[in-house]
């Protein structure tokens, strides 16, 4: 599946568009908003009733090379007494992001866009219980 | 940019870093994964910090549709199904990369853009301070 072309219902293709070879697209990887700083709630991953840890994955042939993944610390959730309650479930929350993959074929290099599923954090859910006959 | 290991037999002229502009195949690897969080799980309803999902659409962006989470309550749902305001429903936010059409409206010319999305909510036990 390909990235959808611009629908004519929205707008006409401007004359100023750069020429692009068929089957490919031009991508500027100078990131817009690269330097914006996010004021994330501090220690949310430790204070959550479904706490999680972070792991950094590194791949030099990917842009960005660093992707952070979360892993739930427990199967159950932490109750008011600080104990794990296994009648509840800690579950991962996931989000897709795009990365650019660099591929080497001999001495030539090609670039491919890739969707990556990132685990962002965890939430505590009430399990759906089925009694098996 | 980031350093790329190079095949020793290749000419030295190749830049070790990612170039600023690249030509990319139009086919996206893993494109067909399910992007509608409502269909992928019902965690948003079953969580102790449930959330609503709002559709954010922008034809100048790929993906054009992004789902934003908004926590349904200030507090968290307790075992009795009531909101416990001694706990907090807090959005889990993540920076993701999307494609922005640049120049605008061009079908095959993009720039990477970093955006902040709320993906879901989690229940947090706050540390309490009594202000003198």
């Amino acid at each position: 599946r390909k990235i959808p072309k611009v629908g004519h219902t929205f707008f006409q293709k401007p004359e100023s568009c750069p020429p692009v070879p068929g089957g490919s697209m031009k991508l500027d990887i100078g990131i817009i908003n690269e330097n914006q700083r996010v004021s994330m709630s501090r220690n949310i991953e430790s204070r959550s009733t479904s706490p999680w840890n972070y792991t950094v994955t590194w791949d030099p042939n990917r842009y960005p090379s660093e992707v952070v993944q979360a892993q739930c610390r427990n199967l159950g959730c932490i109750n008011a007494q600080g104990k794990e309650d296994i009648s509840m479930n800690s579950v991962p929350i996931q989000q897709e992001t795009l990365v650019v993959r660099r591929k080497h074929q001999g001495c030539s290099v090609s670039f491919q866009l890739e969707k990556v599923l990132v685990t962002v954090g965890c939430t505590c859910v009430t399990p759906v219980i089925h009694h098996v006959q | 940019g980031i350093t790329i290991p190079r095949n020793p037999g290749c000419p030295n002229s190749e830049d070790k870093n990612f170039p600023r502009t690249v030509m990319v195949n139009l086919n996206i690897h893993n494109r067909n994964t399910n992007t509608n969080p409502k269909r992928s799980s019902d965690y948003y309803n079953r969580s102790t910090s449930p959330w609503n999902l709002h559709r954010n659409e922008d034809p100048e962006r790929y993906p054009s549709v992004i789902w934003e989470a908004k926590c349904r309550h200030l507090g968290c749902i307790n075992a009795d199904g009531n909101v416990d305001y001694h706990m907090n429903s807090v959005p889990i936010q993540q920076e993701i990369l999307v494609l922005r059409r640049e120049p605008p409206h061009c079908p095959n010319s993009f720039r990477l853009e970093k955006i902040l999305v709320s993906v879901g909510c989690t229940c947090v036990t706050p540390i309490v301070h009594h202000v003198a």
Epitope: S39, S41, R42, I44, R47 | L74, N88, V90, P126, V128
Partner: nanobody, 116 residues
Framework: EVQLVESGGGSVQPGDSLRLSCAAS????????FGWFRQTPGKEREFVAG????????EYANSVKGRFTISRDNSKNTVDLQMNSLRPEDTAVYYC?????????WGQGTLVTVSS
């Protein structure tokens, strides 16, 4: 350090109105929500009303819905609680609460008395 200054408490008759205010100063950034709890002698503190900072979403206890209105002023880091049609059972110490997601600050409280 965060400071909370509450004002507006006092004695009124049933059916009257009162407006409570709370101003936050100091390192009150990344506010999650701002609101009010209340407590009567021998009882637990109960949630009255709260307003989420990011989108002004409001929540109320069932006992005050339709009578109390919470509002905020982002530029001044203040929150107001407009209390109308007050009843004797609204008599309590009202505490301002500033919530920063993982940390919560409680004010010292202001007394509201409703009696004829």
């Amino acid at each position: 350090e965060v400071q909370l200054v509450e004002s507006g408490g006092g004695s009124v008759q049933p059916g009257d109105s009162l407006r409570l205010s709370c101003a936050a100063s100091g390192r009150a950034n990344s506010i999650n929500w701002f609101g009010w709890f209340r407590q009567t002698p021998g009882k637990e503190r109960e949630f009255v009303a709260g307003i989420r900072w990011s989108d002004a979403y409001t929540e109320y206890a069932n006992s005050v819905k339709g009578r109390f209105t919470i509002s905020r002023d982002n530029s001044k880091n203040t929150v107001d609680l407009q209390m109308n049609s007050l009843r004797p059972e609204d008599t309590a110490v009202y505490y301002c609460v500033l919530d920063l997601s993982t940390v919560r600050y409680w004010g010292q409280g202001t007394l509201v008395t409703v009696s004829s």
